[in-house]
């Protein structure tokens, strides 16, 4: 028969022969022969290969370096890499999560729209009219101004985006 020029999925062409690729979690140690299938070996401890392959070396699992604020979110297997995330209060600087930075705080006049996660930073928004934030915080939303009316008080000092209104007693009408 004519030697193949192309092979099926999960095969590779070598020496005019179609050999099976190694399954995920295993590496190539010898091509197939006319008598035998491809020889593959399991990846070692702390190694992985996540595809059908003809790699001769497995990849090292990612190291979640605590000095960079990283911790293991999901332990790697022979078929998957380790997934890192950041310690509490920190988030990844990139999709690959190779290092972490402290969550941003929202300055006075801004509130937290979305609290940060291990992979995304804090999202701040300016406090709209009627709301304020007088602290720098990674958690606090804009608070509504105090309603003086509901306390039977009047506004003595108007609120801003950084300060609450100041309420005071109503002036008594003199007879």
């Amino acid at each position: 028969p004519e030697p193949p020029t192309a092979c099926r999925e999960k095969q590779y062409l070598i020496n005019s022969q179609c050999c099976s690729l190694c399954q995920p979690g295993q590496k190539l140690v010898s091509d197939c022969t006319e008598f035998t299938e491809t020889e593959c070996l399991p990846c070692g401890e702390s190694e992985f290969l996540d595809t059908w392959n003809r790699e001769t070396h497995c990849h090292q699992h990612k190291y979640c370096d605590p000095n960079l604020g990283l911790r293991v979110q999901q332990k790697g297997t022979s078929e998957t890499d380790t997934i890192c995330t950041c310690e509490e209060g920190w988030h990844c600087t990139s999709e690959a999560c190779e290092s972490c930075v402290l969550h941003r705080s929202c300055s006075p006049g801004f509130g937290v729209k979305q609290i940060a996660t291990g992979v995304s930073d804090t999202i701040c928004e300016p406090c709209p009219v009627g709301f304020f934030s007088n602290v720098s915080s990674a958690f606090e939303k804009c608070h509504p101004w105090t309603s003086c009316e509901t306390k039977d008080l009047v506004v003595q000092q108007a609120g801003t985006n950084k300060t609450d209104v100041v309420c005071g007693p109503q002036d008594r009408l003199r007879a």
Epitope: I14, N15, V29, S30, D31, T33, E37, H57
Partner: antibody, heavy 113, light 111 residues
């Protein structure tokens, strides 16, 4: 056609270093491991060692320090550093890592004073 | 070091009979199945029959059958023929630091 052929076997005196060569054709050593196996006259098969795709060698515990396996793009060498009479045997190279699918015909080494 | 013990040796069988050869490893073979069987006739190199404990090498007659896992393996030859007279070797692969090892061989005599 895939084939292997050993060469370099001869009569040597004890202590004289000897290198055997396995010449391969029809396949690539960059994606195949190779083994060396020997057989003393009238005795069984004895695994000496292998060389991996990456070029790192592994040896039987009794063979460490006595034998060295290396390779080029088309040959695999077995060096016997200081042969003794117990090393008299037919030496085979075989393709594979744990499965020795293709064997050469062998080359005879005789160690005698 | 690993030891592969083959039993019995020698073994004889009539034409058409069945031969069973056992191979015991002193430790688990790689992935529990890295064991091969070879046939060798005088003046010839070994020929691969079975690999990964039970896979038949291409071109080998189906009367040869391998089985087993871990440390205990068996080669069975059913319907023995005159041409099967030879010495049979088991060979195991172990984790990377330990390499490979052969059993002592079993001579099969066909009557």
């Amino acid at each position: 056609c895939q084939s292997l052929e050993e060469s370099g076997g001869r009569l040597v005196t004890p202590g004289t270093p000897l290198t055997l060569t396995c010449t391969v054709s029809g396949f690539d050593l960059s994606s195949n491991a190779m083994n060396w196996v020997r057989q003393a006259p009238g005795k069984g098969l004895e695994w000496i060692g292998y060389i991996t795709i990456s070029g790192s060698a592994g040896y039987a515990s009794w063979a460490k320090g006595r034998f060295t396996i290396s390779k080029t793009s088309t040959t695999v060498d077995l060096k016997i550093s200081s042969p003794t009479t117990e090393d008299t045997a037919t030496y085979f190279c075989a393709r594979g890592y744990n499965t020795m699918a293709i064997w050469g015909p062998g080359t005879l080494v005789t160690v005698s004073s | 070091a690993q030891v592969l013990t083959q039993t019995p040796s020698p073994v004889s069988a009539p034409v058409g009979g069945t031969v069973t050869i056992n191979c015991q490893s002193s430790q688990n073979v790689l992935i529990n199945n890295r064991l091969a069987w070879y046939q060798q006739k005088p003046g010839q190199p070994p020929k691969l029959l079975i690999y990964d404990a039970s896979k038949l090498a291409s071109g080998v007659p189906s009367r040869f059958k391998g089985s087993g896992s871990g440390t205990q393996f068996t080669l069975t030859i059913s319907g023995v023929q005159c041409d099967d007279a030879a010495t049979y070797y088991c060979q195991a692969g172990y984790s990377s630091g330990d390499g490979n090892a052969f059993g002592g061989g079993t001579e099969v005599v066909v009557k």
